[in-house]
Interface confidence: low
Amino acid sequence: HTAAQDNCTCPTNKMTVCSPDGPGGRCQCRALGSGMAVDCSTLTSKCLLLKARMSAPKNARTLVRPSEHALVDNDGLYDPDCDPEGRFKARQCNQTSVCWCVNSVGVRRTDKGDLSLRCDELVRTHHILIDLRHRPTAGAFNHSDLDAELRRLFRERYRLHPKFVAAVHYEQPTIQIELRQNTSQKAAGDVDIGDAAYYFERDIKGESLFQGRGGLDLRVRGEPLQVERTLIYYLDEIPPKFSMKRLT
């Protein structure tokens, strides 16, 4: 963008402030909340988005877990600390000096502690299970059509390489989308599954993060796919560390 152009916006993140003050008068966008410069050619990291969203209400969710080590985001929103690249810092603390460790998608993976709590590394979430229930339709969707449409959506809307969409399961009315991405598989420039899942979650809720695009209009062979419930499970490369008290 040059300074004379008035379409200085961030197509992939509406929660930004943009101005033509980059090198050569190019459009530069900064995330609300953190003021960090964002790359509008790709998805913004979930950490920066959460930081920008801090005024939104909490949402708590609980359901039976698909595996003993799966995490569900029951803590809802918090104001996260992000590193210079926009990733979650391994240790998060609130204003009352209560601290906890998070994974790469910002979900708590330890009991809460005090400022002495150590989180040695940011543990990668390598497997995300998105569990959807769709509204009743005249009949079940064709599984292969549904599979193709969801893979297309993740590729074209969220720029997630199809190799990271491990599977799409369907048993009417439940749809499960499995995203898998090990540290070794993720090349420079690849969208992170955690970021794609977060954009998808916000789209499903009618809270699209994209600038100026219409909301998500999901259709399978012309039939609208309307989601009435979403639950997301996160599996980390290293299992979480909770005390037995929490697990009972």
Epitope: H1, P11, T12, G24, R26, D39, C40, S41, T42, R159, H161, P162, K163, A187, A188, G189, D190, R213
Partner: antibody
Framework: QVQLVQSGAEVKKPGASVKVSCKAS????????MQWVRQAPGQGLEWMGW????????KYAEDFKGRVTISADTSTSTAYLQLSSLKSEDTAVYYC??????????????WGQGTLVTVSS | DIQMTQSPSSLSASVGDRVTITCKAS??????VAWYQQKPGKAPKLLIY???YRYTGVPSRFSGSGSGTDFTLTISSLQPEDFAVYYC?????????FGQGTKLEIK
């Protein structure tokens, strides 16, 4: 739908310059890269370079460095290829094509219709 | 630069035949290979990317496989509209390079 529409055919004299335009529609221009590929009559495809439309940064194939300029105008969603010091061997169809930004995505999913550039004295 | 060598350079086949075109990279390109179909006077069309992913709208008779240096495009049952020139391309590193093309003709 996603479309790339290129400017019309050109006839140029050796030593002259040519500028080919490629107007994108149906998607957000700055969320995809624009590549340029040429094809001489009866020959295969040859990559010339590409531009990261978001950052405005071009990259050129070694064979064309110094003669080629790739640019983008985000206000009109248009990419440009300028080739100078034309030779008869530059007679070819020039294509713009959309790609992603990272190497995992440097394949070309949408192509322009092509612009025939003829270099003849 | 990475050289992409296609074989055969031309091929005659009949409708209903199973056809295989191969592409060899001069060095490891992981799975970053795309395949295109081009008909006379037209721009190429993307068929396969990242070695094995079929692009939206491409018929299921087209499939791709391979990794490292050896890649294959297979058409399981040739249709009349499949007679064209096919190109492979590595999208691993710049400069991006194409194979020389394989012309698929009617026998």
């Amino acid at each position: 739908q996603v479309q790339l529409v290129q400017s019309g055919a050109e006839v140029k004299k050796p030593g002259a310059s040519v500028k080919v335009s490629c107007k994108a529609s149906g998607y957000t221009f700055t969320t995809a890269g624009m590549q340029w590929v040429r094809q001489a009559p009866g020959q295969g495809l040859e990559w010339m370079g590409w531009i990261n439309t978001h950052h405005g940064v071009p990259k050129y194939a070694e064979d064309f460095k110094g003669r080629v300029t790739i640019s983008a105008d985000t206000s009109t969603s248009t990419a440009y290829l300028q080739l100078s010091s034309l030779k008869s061997e530059d007679t070819a169809v020039y294509y713009c094509a959309r790609s992603g930004f990272g190497s995992s995505y440097w394949y070309f999913d949408v192509w322009g219709q092509g612009t025939l550039v003829t270099v003849s004295s | 630069d990475i050289q992409m060598t296609q074989s055969p350079s031309s091929l005659s086949a009949s409708v209903g035949d199973r056809v295989t075109i191969t592409c060899k990279a001069s060095q490891d390109v992981s799975t970053a290979v795309a395949w295109y179909q081009q008909k006379p006077g037209k721009a190429p069309k993307l068929l396969i990317y990242s070695a094995s992913y079929r692009y939206t709208g491409v018929p299921s008779r087209f499939s791709g496989s391979g990794s490292g240096t050896d890649f294959t495009l297979t058409i399981s049952s040739l249709q009349p509209e499949d007679f064209a020139v096919y190109y492979c391309q590595q999208h691993y590193i710049t400069p991006l390079t194409f194979g020389q093309g394989t012309k698929l003709e009617i026998k």
